[in-house]
Amino acid sequence: MKVLQEPTCVSDYMSISTCEWKMNGPTNCSTELRLLYQLVFLLSEAHTCIPENNGGAGCVCHLLMDDVVSADNYTLDLWAGQQLLWKGSFKPSEHVKPRAPGNLTVHTNVSDTLLLTWSNPYPPDNYLYNHLTYAVNIWSENDPADFRIYNVTYLEPSLRIAASTLKSGISYRARVRAWAQCYNTTWSEWSPSTKWHNSYREPFEQH
């Protein structure tokens, strides 16, 4: 049994780090493998993650952490029984993938304006809470070419757009994702999408 693709890990900078790797053949990850992780810190102890299958030869492990601070560094040991298959380290602050925003809502009752709001996925005491910026994706269900991205570079989790920038009388969907420049993170996954029917009064044409 050998590791084909070494584990790579990302942290949500809150309570979970996710590590993925590939073995050289079909593997029952949960019965054959264990990933041990230990914070490099005085008196810390090793903790065990039981991996799950992620495709035939792929494994994924969700490492539970109490919290994360920038100085944290973990040792990782991948075991198959008594055999050490791989040894490495992981610094969560250098491999951050934020949590996806939630509760995306489209408010259509504001005159001729669409107000999109969503929730910051972090609690106020988390460092990323005040460092997230967002991308909002809006697209038409009827027209694949009608696809747009709005970058939200301010901290407030909301976006206002004129309803007239979208076509009237058709359905649109929106989703939002987040990233944090301070830790040069990857983008989060997209939030679940939300759907609304766009309708607004066209201004009278004057001749």
Epitope: L42, L43, S44, E45, M65, D66, D67, V69, D72
Partner: antibody
């Protein structure tokens, strides 16, 4: 009530051995690291040794390394300090103290928040 | 090893007056984002040490609010807003970020 009670101190000749015990109660003993600190007569406090909750990690002061062994029996809620090759400079009151919570991924530190009453070790010929 | 230096070593105080003890470490005790591994202990005559402050500024359970800790990195201070007769004893700072844990020399607080 959270409590630590040391025992095992006494008078011993140089080169001799003693085993100190520290019985913990009122808290989940296995979840916490434990520490030994000593105080020579008329002197300040000196750290001696620490051990993690499971006993997998042990640390020693240079002055006792190779002579003292820290251990614990979590089934008995008891911490030990085996002291061999004793020297006159080991004469001190020995305290055990409750250290950080090591059952968590990040050891959570509340200070050495509970101390035993101390046990006196005298090394003299 | 990290060297902890306390000052003053002797502190005569009038009851009701404030008192301040300084502790300086030879290396930073800041692990990350507010985790300064510096404690303050009081040892009264004939007793075991007792925890006053942990992680530089957190008051231990049951410690009167006249005791406060501050500082970060290498410079720390213990303040007693109004000294009472029962506060006499030796005050020690201790770092626990690295082994060996190291203590300051101790400050003897006495009543004038």
């Amino acid at each position: 009530e959270v409590q630590l009670v040391e025992s095992g101190g006494g008078l011993e000749q140089p080169g001799g051995s003693l085993r100190l015990s520290c019985a913990g109660s009122g808290f989940t003993f296995r979840d916490y690291a434990m520490t030994w600190v000593r105080q020579a007569p008329g002197k300040g406090l000196e750290w001696v040794s620490s051990i993690s909750g499971s006993g997998s990690n042990k640390y020693y002061a240079d002055s006792v390394k190779g002579r003292f062994t820290i251990s614990r029996d979590n089934s008995k809620n008891t911490l030990y300090l085996q002291m061999n090759s004793l020297r006159a400079e080991d004469t001190a009151v020995y305290y055990c103290a409750k250290d950080r919570l090591t059952s968590r991924v990040r050891p959570y530190y509340y200070g050495l928040d509970v101390w035993g009453q101390g046990t006196t070790v005298t090394v003299s010929s | 090893d990290i060297v902890m230096t306390q000052s003053p070593l002797s502190l005569p105080v009038t009851p009701g007056e404030p008192a301040s003890i300084s502790c300086r470490s030879s290396q930073s005790l800041l692990y990350s984002q507010g985790y300064n591994y510096l404690d303050w202990y009081l040892q009264k005559s004939g007793q075991s040490p007792q925890l006053l402050i942990y992680l530089a500024s957190n008051r231990a359970s049951g410690v009167p609010d006249r005791f406060s800790g501050s500082g970060s990195g290498t410079d720390f201070t213990l303040k007693i807003s109004r000294v009472e007769a029962e506060d006499v004893g030796f005050y020690y700072c201790m770092q626990s970020l690295f082994t060996p844990y190291t203590f300051g020399q101790g400050t003897k607080l006495e009543i004038k």
